[in-house]
């Protein structure tokens, strides 16, 4: 049939909860292409009816929820004007009781469910939530050994759990929980994460480089909306936290009530030698109190700020 076959690594998935897989294979999917999902080499495509438990949502296949019988090989066919690629994804559904303390780790879990914290450092865990835009995700709750995590060493930031001054006691079984809403129905997503610790620097002691900002000022009119990207390059193996702070406080915490200034979701692009990270800060409405205040982008030990300033008066207008 002229399609190139591409085999993805196996995915281990938890039963009875939502799961989605995006059929992306850059640069194939960056142009004008059609994407169709199939199960177990069936000639009949996966349904696109949003009420179906399993359906295609744009380039995604969405299970609401995943069930035992859903294990198998799924294919997505990407057809371009002059090309065809068939991507094979092997999905294995398992039953995992996250509070079963007799199970010491899960060796077959996908890598994103095994994470490492660095002793004595400020580090973070990530709740990997890959779902299409049609899925609305609520706030994330974090658990360790089935108890909700509390304490001043822990901060929830977007999809991350920040852990300050990591200790040996921080190793063990974690879970992040979120309520997903799709077409008015609610589903629970509970991702178990086995967390191990290391003393190793992990990234060879290299320092992340902040490409932008450069301790610079930005001219911005009062009352306007402003979005500023912080661009960072870092080694692929880094465990650095990336965030925006003001007055040495996370912006999301500092503006917790008004939510007028917020940190965006971190994205990254992977290059051969390094990752390029972007995390933005959004000012919904610039106020007088924002001028002259350093808004700091932090990445590990690196930091750089932007400072807002009023534009110089334009005398030509008079």
């Amino acid at each position: 049939d002229g399609c190139n076959d591409i085999f993805m690594k196996n995915e281990m998935l938890s039963a009875s909860q939502p799961f989605a897989f995006n059929c992306t294979f850059p640069p194939i999917t960056s142009g004008e292409v059609s994407v169709t999902w199939y199960k177990n080499s069936s000639k009949i495509p996966v349904s696109k009816i949003i009420q179906s438990r399993i359906h295609q949502d744009e380039t995604w296949i969405l299970f609401l929820p995943m069930e035992w019988g859903d294990s198998g090989v799924y294919q997505c066919v990407i057809k371009g004007r002059d090309s065809c690629h068939r991507i094979h994804v092997n999905l294995t559904v398992f039953e995992k009781q996250w509070c079963d303390t007799s199970v010491k780790g899960l060796p077959n879990l996908s890598d994103e469910y095994k994470q490492i914290l660095h002793l004595g450092k400020d580090d973070s865990l990530t709740c990997h939530l890959h779902f299409p835009k049609s899925c609305i995700l609520g706030p994330i709750k974090w658990y360790k050994d089935c108890n909700e995590i509390t304490g001043e060493r822990f901060t929830v930031l977007e999809t991350r759990l920040l852990v300050s001054n990591v200790s040996a006691e921080d190793r063990g079984n974690y879970a992040c929980q979120v309520i997903l809403t799709h077409s008015g129905k609610q589903y629970e997503v509970l991702n178990g994460i086995t967390v191990s610790i290391t003393e190793r620097a992990g990234y060879g002691g290299s320092v992340p480089k902040i490409i932008y900002p450069k301790n610079n000022s930005i001219e911005v009119q009062l009352g306007t909306t402003l979005i500023v990207d912080c661009n960072i390059t870092d080694t692929k193996d880094n465990t650095n936290l990336r965030c925006w702070r003001v007055n040495n406080t996370l912006v999301d915490d500092y503006y917790n009530e008004s939510k007028r200034i917020r940190e965006g979701v971190e994205t990254h692009a992977s290059f051969r030698e390094y990752n390029l990270y972007t995390v933005n800060i959004t000012f919904l409405e610039v106020k007088m109190e924002d001028y002259g205040l350093p808004f700091m982008c932090h990445a590990g030990v690196s930091a750089a700020y932007i400072m807002l300033q009023l534009p110089a008066p334009d005398f030509r207008a008079y």
Epitope: I197, K236, D237
Partner: antibody, heavy 120, light 106 residues
């Protein structure tokens, strides 16, 4: 159960390159840290280096100019190359990994070791 | 580099003896790891995170210490304990082992 197995030639000529393979079963080398350690005859253990889950490599500075650790995730194998060997590189070479009780540095799983002799 | 100095280098002792092996680091380390090695065999993880016994290690073994001084203690030596013991640190690269302590039957 995690198992590691070293393989490679037992005899290498001086000035040549020593090449060893560690084949891993029961775990994926895309998680954790994968180490090489050697034991000189009648002497102690020497840490050579590691390759991490992401492919990052660390080498002991005393060997850095001569050592390369690499991997093939499709085969679940990782490798040691040591160039310009001399008789001082004669040792039993071990591959090992941690993760015991969620501690990556607790090297719980070891290969059986392979003796490499450098001699003409 | 952090130098790890074990003492004694070798030790003759009798079954039932209490034995202490010391590992001194040239700079502070956060945790110590101990390995047991018998002739012709791979090392075995014995003690991790300074004081935790690995699976299968008898309770007569214990580990303690902090900063630059760490000890492995055997409360009552048994025939199967005769081996070489190594300490190791992962706090600062290069990750170094002690030179080993050979425990022999008197």
């Amino acid at each position: 159960q995690v198992q590691l197995q070293e393989s490679g030639p037992g005899l290498v000529k001086p000035s040549q390159t020593l090449s060893l393979t560690c084949t891993v079963s029961g775990a994926s080398i895309t998680s954790g840290y994968w180490n090489w350690i050697r034991n000189h005859p009648g002497k102690g253990l020497e840490y050579i280096g590691y390759i991490s889950y992401s492919g990052y490599t660390y080498y002991n500075p005393s060997l850095k100019s001569r050592v390369t650790i690499s991997r093939d995730t499709s085969k679940n194998q990782y490798y040691l190359k040591l160039s310009s060997v001399t008789a001082a590189d004669t040792a039993v070479y071990y591959c090992a990994t941690g993760g015991y009780d969620y501690v990556e540095d607790a090297l719980y799983y070891w290969g059986q070791g392979t003796l490499v002799t450098v001699s003409s | 580099d952090i130098q790890m100095t074990q003492s004694p280098s070798s030790l003759s002792a009798s079954v039932g003896d209490r034995v202490t092996i010391t590992c001194r680091a040239s700079s502070n380390v956060r945790y110590m790891y101990w390995y047991q090695q018998k002739p012709g065999k791979a090392p075995k993880l014995w003690i991790y995170l300074t004081s935790n016994l690995a699976s299968g290690v008898p309770s007569r073994f214990s580990g303690s210490g902090s900063g630059t001084s760490y000890t492995l203690t055997i409360s009552s030596l048994q025939p199967e304990d005769f081996a070489t013991y190594y300490c190791q640190q992962f706090t600062t690269s290069p990750y170094t082992f002690g030179q080993g302590t050979k425990l022999e039957i008197k």
